[in-house]
């Protein structure tokens, strides 16, 4: 969490951003909140990016003002206009790309004063893994697949029964570059699996951590997966 203040105490407002991550090929949100004002027409929101000459986005007098917008962001940005009055200056970014990563500044002017806060925005790819029993294999084998990751993640297997066990000797992980030549498909195979046990395939890079669980019994197979973004620090 980054909390920024205006320069002079009497004319400063608190602006708060949260470091976040964008999944390339999706819309992303850069979070920013501020002390609200009672009049929308008195609020100015400016988003800037380090190393970019033009503005990322500007909203003032109750509407978008995009005449100074940098070409890199043309047609891609929006604030949530109906939420500005309650102090939400978050930015929506369409079709996030790797090049959108960097340091952004959320700069706010209201009738109470000015304030700003920086935000570190990371971009990459992350997806939910799916763990299945590989019936084609000669022994009981699990196959963990996740379609899109970047940067290259680590893959670790764990088991409920053998907690703390190191499965690196009985697993094999491969990374296959996807057709757009950025993201990669992750495939990890775990051998010598025992029945009546829950196995977890954990995929992690510096942006996200995802886990796929599978419980194999004589009568059924249960699956569960979840994904968590890392480094969501507020400023």
């Amino acid at each position: 969490l980054i909390i920024g203040f205006g320069i002079s105490g009497r004319h400063s407002i608190t602006v708060t951003t949260v470091a976040s991550a964008g999944n390339i090929g999706e819309d992303g949100i850069l979070s920013c909140t501020f002390e609200p004002d009672i009049k929308l027409s008195d609020i100015v929101i400016q988003w800037l990016k380090e190393g970019v000459l033009g503005l990322v986005h500007e909203f003032k007098e109750g509407k978008d003002e995009l005449s100074e917008q940098d070409e890199m962001f043309r047609g891609r940005t929006a604030v949530f206009a109906d939420q500005v009055i309650v102090g939400n200056a978050s930015l929506r970014l369409k079709n996030v790309q790797l090049t959108d990563a960097g340091t952004y500044k959320c700069y706010i002017i209201t009738s109470k004063g000015k304030g700003n806060a920086n935000l570190e925005y990371k971009t990459g790819a992350f997806s939910m893994p799916e763990v299945n029993v590989d019936y084609n294999a000669s022994s009981e084998t699990l196959r963990c697949e996740a379609p899109r990751w970047f940067p290259q993640p680590t893959v670790v297997w764990a088991s409920q029964v053998d907690q703390g066990a190191n499965f690196s000797e009985v697993s094999n992980t491969s990374f296959e570059l996807n057709s757009e030549n950025v993201t990669m498909k992750v495939v990890s195979v775990l051998y010598n699996v025992t029945i009546n046990n829950t196995y977890s395939c954990m995929i992690e890079n510096d942006i996200a951590k995802a886990t796929g669980d599978i419980k194999v019994t004589e009568s059924e197979i249960k699956r569960r997966s979840h994904l968590q973004l890392l480094n969501s620090k507020a400023s």
Partner: antibody
Framework: EVQLVESGGGLIQPGGSLRLSCAAS????????MNWVRQAPGKGLEWVSV???????DAADSVKGRFTISRDNSKNTLYLQMNSLRAEDTAVYYC??????????WGQGTTVTVSS | EIVLTQSPGTLSLSPGERATLSCRAS???????LAWYQQKPGQAPRLLIY???SRATGIPDRFSGSGSGTDFTLTISRLEPEDFAVYYC??????????FGQGTKLEIK
């Protein structure tokens, strides 16, 4: 040259299925938001479905559960699988690339007629 | 659900005249996500304006877009014979993800 070419349209009975294809050239489908948009005879444009660069999909309520958008990255091709077709699905179906600057590339359209 | 209402439904003008087409949204739309398209009979739509006011590649400067919030305008400063067509506004980002207006038919008077 940046281009989209649709195929797969035709006459189909109510309740039937059809798969539309849209072959892209000059750009990579998986880096863009790719859409299907339709136009019923004498009517306006109606958005049908999108597949994001990430592979996630969304669709209009009118086709959810019946139509599925997908892509084959190796063939650089977009698809629309249409099941449980109804008379009101009769339209010209366009595929369109939504680049950063709006739907800037459109195919020529393929006609789907649902009739008994 | 965002509804885009275009007016007038039909606009009858002569070549050389100025055309003003309106697009009103039922709730606020980001200027970045508002586009205008032209469609001629038997043809696919063509992107004219994106980001409410930026001309797409190859679009003549007689076409201009303006507006913000809920009110957007497409202006054709001097009508050429090839400009007579149907025009659609479109928004991105709300539910449904993409919405088109019902269209304005620009016809020769």
């Amino acid at each position: 040259e940046v281009q989209l070419v649709e195929s797969g349209g035709g006459l189909i009975q109510p309740g039937g299925s059809l798969r539309l294809s849209c072959a892209a050239s000059g750009f990579i489908v998986s880096r863009n938001y790719m859409n299907w948009v339709r136009q019923a005879p004498g009517k306006g444009l109606e958005w049908v479905s999108v597949i994001y660069g990430s592979g996630r999909t969304d669709a209009a309520d009118s086709v959810k559960g019946r139509f599925t958008i997908s892509r084959d990255n190796s063939k650089n091709t977009l698809y629309l699988q249409m099941n449980s077709l109804r008379a009101e699905d009769t339209a010209v179906y366009y595929c369109a690339r939504d680049g950063d600057y709006g739907m800037d590339v459109w195919g020529q359209g393929t006609t789907v007629t649902v009739s008994s | 659900e965002i509804v885009l209402t275009q007016s007038p439904g039909t606009l009858s003008l002569s070549p050389g005249e100025r055309a003003t087409l309106s697009c009103r949204a039922s709730q606020s739309v980001s200027s970045s996500y508002l586009a205008w398209y032209q469609q001629k009979p038997g043809q696919a739509p063509r992107l004219l304006i994106y980001g409410a006011s930026s001309r797409a590649t190859g679009i003549p400067d007689r076409f201009s877009g303006s507006g913000s919030g809920t009110d957007f305008t497409l202006t054709i400063s001097r009508l050429e014979p090839e400009d007579f067509a149907v025009y659609y506004c479109q928004q991105y980002g709300s539910s449904p993800l993409y919405t088109f207006g019902q269209g304005t038919k620009l016809e020769i008077k």
